[in-house]
């Protein structure tokens, strides 16, 4: 085959070698590109900035060598059109720093970048815990700062990342109010700082207010729905990143809705209770409490980890005539009390009525309209009902 | 696979009490009812108790009630059942055996008691 | 509380021989429980539900009956058979127990 004059020449059946001396200056309209898989660079002393739009459209790149080159400088946001990318060789430029944004979000099994006169500071702290870590081959290069030493050896001890605190309310929210938020933020070295909001959705109207080191938020006409849902934080340094999540009770009262008796390996009655704080439960049978027993009793589905509603069920092993009749599920909580109650029929009754035939659980009387009795439990009582608190 | 682990043999002299443990692998804790069920030497099966790890509702037999204390430690997915006030006719085999939607599906080793003075 | 009485207390069988115990209720309950247990060993669940099989049980253990009435049937003795059985009720608290019915080697 001839060989190739050009300053990019094909290399097997999706990589490009650029190797002719001083030929780039950037990585605009490189041959090809949509389809590389392999780029490598050599002798390239103008090539000085590695950006965004360099490596647009190199969607499918898995390997960049840039060597024995003039890069200088690499852009954060560099790679974000190449989340393919899993090979980095930057070896011998003019490198003295490259952020950790420039490689978050890769999953890189080899970083190179021996040869290159790295200035030793905070912002190099993620790239010597990759090193003390053992992470994309980084110790074997033995880094060096140019005039420092090792990298190893420098001193870290105040290369932290931003340090947030979120303040929330103490006092209850309720559905409605509006709710102000604030994220204090240091350390040194500030540079970004935010809010993540992706989660509220319809949950509340938001305002965002002052910036660093101190940033509001205000959720104004808070709806119940806000509640289990994350606000988040975040802020950046030239060491890392901080994120604190905070989530807001809006207290709202019990609700509960019975359905159906049906038959799931054995019976269950299902339900759904929702309040916040976490309803109490108590089951009623005709009229009496139900003491529930290790044959009929309260089980709760796995719960959504961002709403405060819980499904469950009144299971009821063994079901026969006896327990037959109308259950009630009582849910209360301190802003309000809510019940619902359903009609089961497990068995028709074999028998007559035979005075003797065991009542399968234990009842007490209770008034209906009263709320919820203490949760609390004594574990040498056999207590008088059964509460279980929800959440 | 679902195994109860019983704690050793214990001999105590009539009055005090005795604290038998049983610690669960192989399923969700939470989940089951943990029963206690003893046997005295040459007898039949008794009943003392059910507790439900998932919120600490314990049932207990009335014969038992005011000396046998059930209990759950659920970061470490055991169940304990305490008995006071030992007399020589406590002497027996302690179990403990799990249900969920089922009796007893599966049961402890067994933890012998011995009440001597 | 619902007390179980088994009959008989013991009995002397052969292998191969067809086996019923009967578990009769003080008062009615939906179904009936059984347990064989060897000695020095602990129960081990072998019908449910009066006559489900418990999973590694032979076929030839069944469970029938209703109200106060139940049995538990062998129809052909195995050597492993030769056991202690309880029969149990899961409707009432507290939980009850047959008293057992041995079952010994002719």
């Known amino acids: 085959a001839a060989p190739c004059p050009d300053a990019c020449c094909p290399h097997g059946s999706s990589g490009l070698r650029c190797t002719r001396d001083g030929a780039l200056d950037s990585l605009h309209h490189l041959p090809g590109a949509e389809n590389l898989t392999e780029l490598y660079i050599e002798n390239q002393q103008h090539l000085q900035h590695l950006e965004l739009r360099d490596l647009r459209g190199l969607g499918e790149l898995r390997n960049l060598t840039i060597v024995k080159s003039g890069l200088r400088f690499v852009a954060p946001d560099a790679f974000h059109f190449t989340p393919r990318l899993s090979r980095l060789n930057l070896s011998f430029n003019a490198l003295e720093s490259l952020s950790w944004k420039t490689v978050q979000g890769l999953s890189l099994q080899e970083l190179v970048l021996s040869g290159n006169p790295l200035h030793c500071s905070c912002a190099l702290r993620w790239l010597q815990r990759w090193e003390e870590e053992g992470l994309g081959g980084v110790p074997e290069q033995k880094l060096q700062c140019h005039g420092q030493g090792p990298l190893a050896h420098m001193p870290n001890a105040s290369c932290g990342v931003p340090t947030l605190k979120v303040q929330v309310p103490n006092a209850s929210v309720d559905v409605g109010d509006d709710v102000l938020l604030r994220c204090q933020v240091e350390g040194r070295g500030l540079e970004q700082a935010g809010w993540i909001l992706t989660e509220l959705e319809q949950s509340a109207t938001v305002m965002k207010s002052g910036g660093l080191p101190s940033l509001g938020l205000t959720l104004a006409n808070v709806t119940s729905d806000l509640n289990r849902k994350n606000v988040t934080c975040w802020a950046e340094n030239d060491v890392g990143r901080a994120e604190v999540s905070v989530q807001v009770n809006v207290s709202f009262p019990a609700s509960v809705q019975l359905h159906t008796a049906v038959e799931m390996h054995h019976w269950c009655i299902p339900f759904s209770v929702d309040g916040q704080p976490a309803p109490s439960l108590r089951w009623l049978f005709n009229g009496s409490v139900l003491n529930e027993t290790s044959f009929i009793f309260t089980e709760f589905l796995e719960p959504a980890a961002n709403e405060t509603v819980r499904h469950g069920c009144l299971r009821l092993n063994q079901p026969t005539h006896v327990n037959n009749g109308n259950y009630t599920l009582l849910a209360a909580n301190p802003f309000g009390q809510a019940s619902a109650s359903i009609m089961a029929a497990f068995m028709d009754n074999p028998f007559e009525f035979n005075p003797e035939d065991p009542i399968p659980v234990s009842f007490s009387p209770v008034d209906t309209n009263s709320t919820s009795g203490d949760p609390v439990e004594k574990k040498d009582e056999t207590p008088f009902g059964v509460s279980v608190a929800v959440g | 696979q679902v195994q109860l682990v019983q704690s050793g043999a214990e001999v105590k002299k009539p009055g005090a009490s005795v604290k038998v443990s049983c610690k669960s692998s192989?399923?969700?804790?939470?989940?089951?009812?943990m029963h206690w069920v003893r046997q005295a030497p040459g007898q039949g099966l008794e009943w003392m108790g059910e507790?439900?790890?998932?919120?600490?509702?314990?049932n207990y037999n009335e014969k038992f009630k005011n000396r046998v204390t059930m209990t759950v430690d659920i970061s470490i997915s055991t169940a304990y059942m305490e008995l006071s006030r030992l007399r020589s006719d406590d002497t027996a085999v302690y179990y403990c055996?799990?249900?969920?939607?089922?009796?007893?599906?599966?049961w402890g080793q067994g933890t012998t008691v011995t009440v001597s003075s | 509380q619902v007390q179980l009485t088994q009959s008989p207390s013991s009995l002397s069988a052969s292998v191969g021989d067809r086996v019923t115990i009967t578990c009769s209720a003080s008062s009615s309950v939906g179904y009936m429980h059984w347990y064989q247990q060897k000695p020095g060993k602990a129960p081990k669940r072998l019908i449910y539900d009066t006559s489900k099989l418990a999973s590694g049980v032979p076929s030839r253990f069944s469970g029938s009956g209703s109200g106060t009435d139940y049995t538990l049937t062998i129809s052909s003795l195995q050597p492993e058979d030769f056991a202690t059985y309880f029969c149990?009720?899961?409707?009432?608290?507290?939980?009850?127990f047959g008293q057992g019915t041995r079952l010994e080697i002719k």
């Open positions: 149990q009720q899961w409707s009432s608290i507290p939980l009850t």
């Open positions: 192989g399923y969700t804790f939470t989940n089951y009812w």
């Open positions: 055996a799990r249900s969920r939607y089922d009796p007893m599906e599966d």
């Open positions: 507790i439900y790890p998932n919120n600490g509702r314990v």
